[in-house]
């Protein structure tokens, strides 16, 4: 008989982000013998699986073990084999699943146990899979860039490891976008979080956190766009949608079924004389901009300051990482650089905005044309949320980092997910001796 | 030495019930996933099922001619892996052998004797 | 689930020749296939694990190949003792299957 091979002096994780829009799984490396230390995990392999979300899945719930194959036999190949069984993997579902959850408990709970079933038959330490609630979105992804930045070391360094990095060890604030949701967490400068449900405390590294976080569901940019349309076709004369939001000269037909399937359109839903109608695309940035504020119920707010929709938000603090959505679509707009100004992203948009649609087809063919002639709207939008719904200035925009990947590992809240459920995030500074379990968060 | 030990073999009757045990010995069987494979007379190897560890909650697969009326389970403490066997059916007449690998996974490394079930009327 | 098909069902040989065993799985598994010998009222040995690797304590005149779908178990010089059945099993995914097995005889 053979002898258990002696593990690698490294070890493995995987986690699965089940997005509203796709799945991604990652895969994240670290010595063994530094468990406890900051910034020694790092993402090794990002694998994107072919298709939609998860949450699309209700009524073929039987293609769901095929639709996970390719990117769990990529992490077999990328994982050596000796390593399988000790490799946990979690996966995370956010808002998609969220929203299914709302319209039918039963059928999100059977999509997932059928994507338990189909991940429990791979060779890996299979530890669940859930929905995470927007708060821990929030959280993890606060986690996941300021451990990559190095904010959690005690050690005070005279050199730079990353760009963002200024050498304090105050923590970014994180921006996170994503089709159905959208959080923003930061710690506030010495102000009370009025309301409860946007407080968390952790205690990492020996050090205390008091941090804001709020989760917006509906507000990611696929559902916002949905929450749109639902909008503005309520006082539309006909079948015609004159859009602004997208460029002149886009026609594309819209199933009024389709428009009320999510949860977000329903406080817009109304009996519409037609099945169908038609966006036609007039591309102007202004016009755009407003109708998206529409969105943002600022009227009302029962604290000393809101976002939007009655939503406390304290004063904004420190620089920000903007990720996911946020940093994919500024960087195909080409906006992501540190020296654009509020005023030149604004710029910016309104001439993308008023470029003819045959035009943009030619100038990114190798594009695919549904998320080609999205990307008008989602600037527009990431730009109202940034300014209205969350108070960005001219002034305070150069504090936001566009960030894709930090240290090569992917901005996002799967990096802090997996950090927290191997116990890797010490509440105390660590020692020589590694602690036991119950001092971390 | 590495020994797996199975018993509780036997005649039942089509419909009946039977449980297998399996003793191992040698090796720190808390650590390994377990496994039954079987061999009607004759005929070639069937792979019954699996046991995984408690940190994976003790996760069970089956072959699907045995899903639903067969259940694995595993005594840590003891040292010993169980096969439940209800509504047999004269097509579970076989040899059951318990097995593990104790180098990496799915493949059997490690063979008990054997114990035969007969479902027979 | 993936079907292993071996060829030939029975292979009639002489001692010191050499024995060529086929083993073709449904579809490609990789290198996730492994080889057990058995004799009469014997349990199965392992003889070949990860398509190639060999056993510590396995005559070295057995030897393995192939990934994909195509493999191939090679016995150099057959001696009295290799005389047995032998089967090929899926180590890729669930649930394992195991092929229908060869049965090498004394020609």
């Known amino acids: 008989t053979q002898n258990k091979a002696l593990p690698e002096n490294v070890k493995y994780g995987i986690v699965l982000d089940a997005g509203s829009s796709h799945t991604s799984l990652y895969i994240y490396k670290w010595p063994a013998e530094k468990e406890n230390d900051t910034g020694v995990v790092h993402q090794v392999e990002e694998c994107r699986v072919k298709g939609p979300g998860i949450s699309k899945f209700v009524q073929k719930v039987n293609e769901i073990g095929i639709y996970l194959t390719d990117c769990m036999e990529r992490a077999r190949e990328v994982i050596p084999r000796s390593q399988h069984q000790e490799t946990p993997v979690y996966l995370g579902a956010t808002a998609g699943m969220r929203l299914l959850r709302m319209e039918s408990e039963e059928l999100a709970d059977r999509v997932l146990d059928v994507v338990e079933r189909s991940l429990s038959n791979y060779p890996f330490d299979f530890q669940g899979a859930r929905i995470i609630t927007g708060q821990e979105e929030g959280a993890y992804g606060w986690i996941t860039i300021n451990y990559l930045l190095g904010k959690f070391s005690q050690k005070t360094r005279w050199f730079s490891i990353v760009p963002y990095e200024t050498n304090n060890q105050e923590t970014f604030g994180a921006l996170d976008l994503g089709g159905a949701s959208t959080q923003v967490t930061f710690v506030p400068q010495n102000q009370t979080i009025e309301s409860p449900d946007n407080a968390l405390q952790f205690r990492l590294y020996g050090k205390d956190y008091n941090v804001y976080t709020h989760s917006f569901l509906c507000y990611g940019k696929d559902q916002a766009l949905w929450q749109k349309l639902a909008k503005d076709i309520q006082v539309a004369s006909n079948e015609i949608l004159r859009d602004p939001c997208f460029h002149p000269g886009y026609k594309k037909v819209v199933n009024v079924s389709d428009l009320y399937k999510t949860p977000c359109t329903k406080r817009f839903e109304m009996t519409l004389p037609f099945q169908q109608f038609e966006i036609q695309g007039i591309g102007n940035y202004q016009q755009c901009h407003q109708s998206i504020l529409e969105l943002f119920n600022t009227s009302y707010c029962p604290y000393s300051q809101c976002a939007f929709n009655g939503i406390f938000l304290p004063p904004l603090q420190g620089d920000f990482g903007a990720f996911s959505a946020f940093y994919f679509v500024m960087k195909f707009l080409n906006l992501t650089s540190e020296k654009v100004s509020q005023e030149k992203v604004t710029e910016m948009m309104k001439k993308f905005c008023a470029q003819p649609w045959e035009e943009i087809k030619t100038s990114y063919a190798g594009v695919k044309e549904k998320y080609l002639s999205e990307y008008c709207f989602s600037g527009t939008y990431i730009l109202s949320l940034l300014l209205q719904g969350y108070h960005f200035t001219a002034d305070s925009w150069e504090h936001i980092h566009f960030i894709g990947k930090i240290q090569g590992s992917d901005a996002g809240w799967t990096l802090g997910y997996m950090l927290n459920l191997t116990n890797m995030i010490p509440a105390e500074q660590p020692l020589s001796t590694p602690l036991s379990h119950s001092t971390y968060v | 030495e590495v020994q797996l030990v199975e018993s509780g073999g036997g005649l039942v009757k089509p419909g009946g019930s039977l449980r297998l045990s399996c003793a191992a010995s040698?090796?720190?069987?808390?650590?390994?996933?377990m496994n039954w494979v079987r061999q009607a007379p004759g005929k070639g190897l069937e792979w019954v099922g699996e046991i995984r560890l408690k940190s994976n909650k003790y996760g069970t697969h089956y072959a699907e001619s045995v899903k639903g009326r067969f259940t694995i389970s595993r005594d840590d403490s003891k040292n010993t892996l169980y096969l439940q066997m209800n509504s047999l059916k004269t097509e579970d007449t076989a040899v059951y052998y318990c097995?593990?690998?104790?180098?990496?996974?799915?493949?059997?490394?490690?063979w008990g004797q054997g114990t035969t079930v007969t479902v027979s009327s | 689930e993936i079907v292993l098909t071996q060829s030939p069902a029975t292979l009639s040989l002489s001692p010191g020749e050499r024995a060529t065993l086929s083993c073709r799985a449904s579809q490609s598994i990789s290198d996730y296939l492994h080889w057990y010998q058995q004799k009469p009222g014997q349990s199965p040995r392992l003889l070949i694990y990860?398509?190639?690797q060999s056993i510590s304590g396995i005559p070295a005149r057995f030897s393995g190949s192939g990934s994909g779908t195509d493999f191939t178990l090679t016995i150099s010089s057959l001696e009295p003792e290799d005389f047995a059945v032998y089967f090929c099993q899926n180590g890729h995914s669930l649930p394992l299957t195991f092929g229908g097995g060869t049965k090498l005889e004394i020609k």
């Open positions: 990860y398509a190639s």
């Open positions: 097995t593990t690998q104790l180098d990496l996974y799915w493949f059997f490394d490690v």
């Open positions: 040698g090796f720190t069987f808390s650590k390994y996933w």
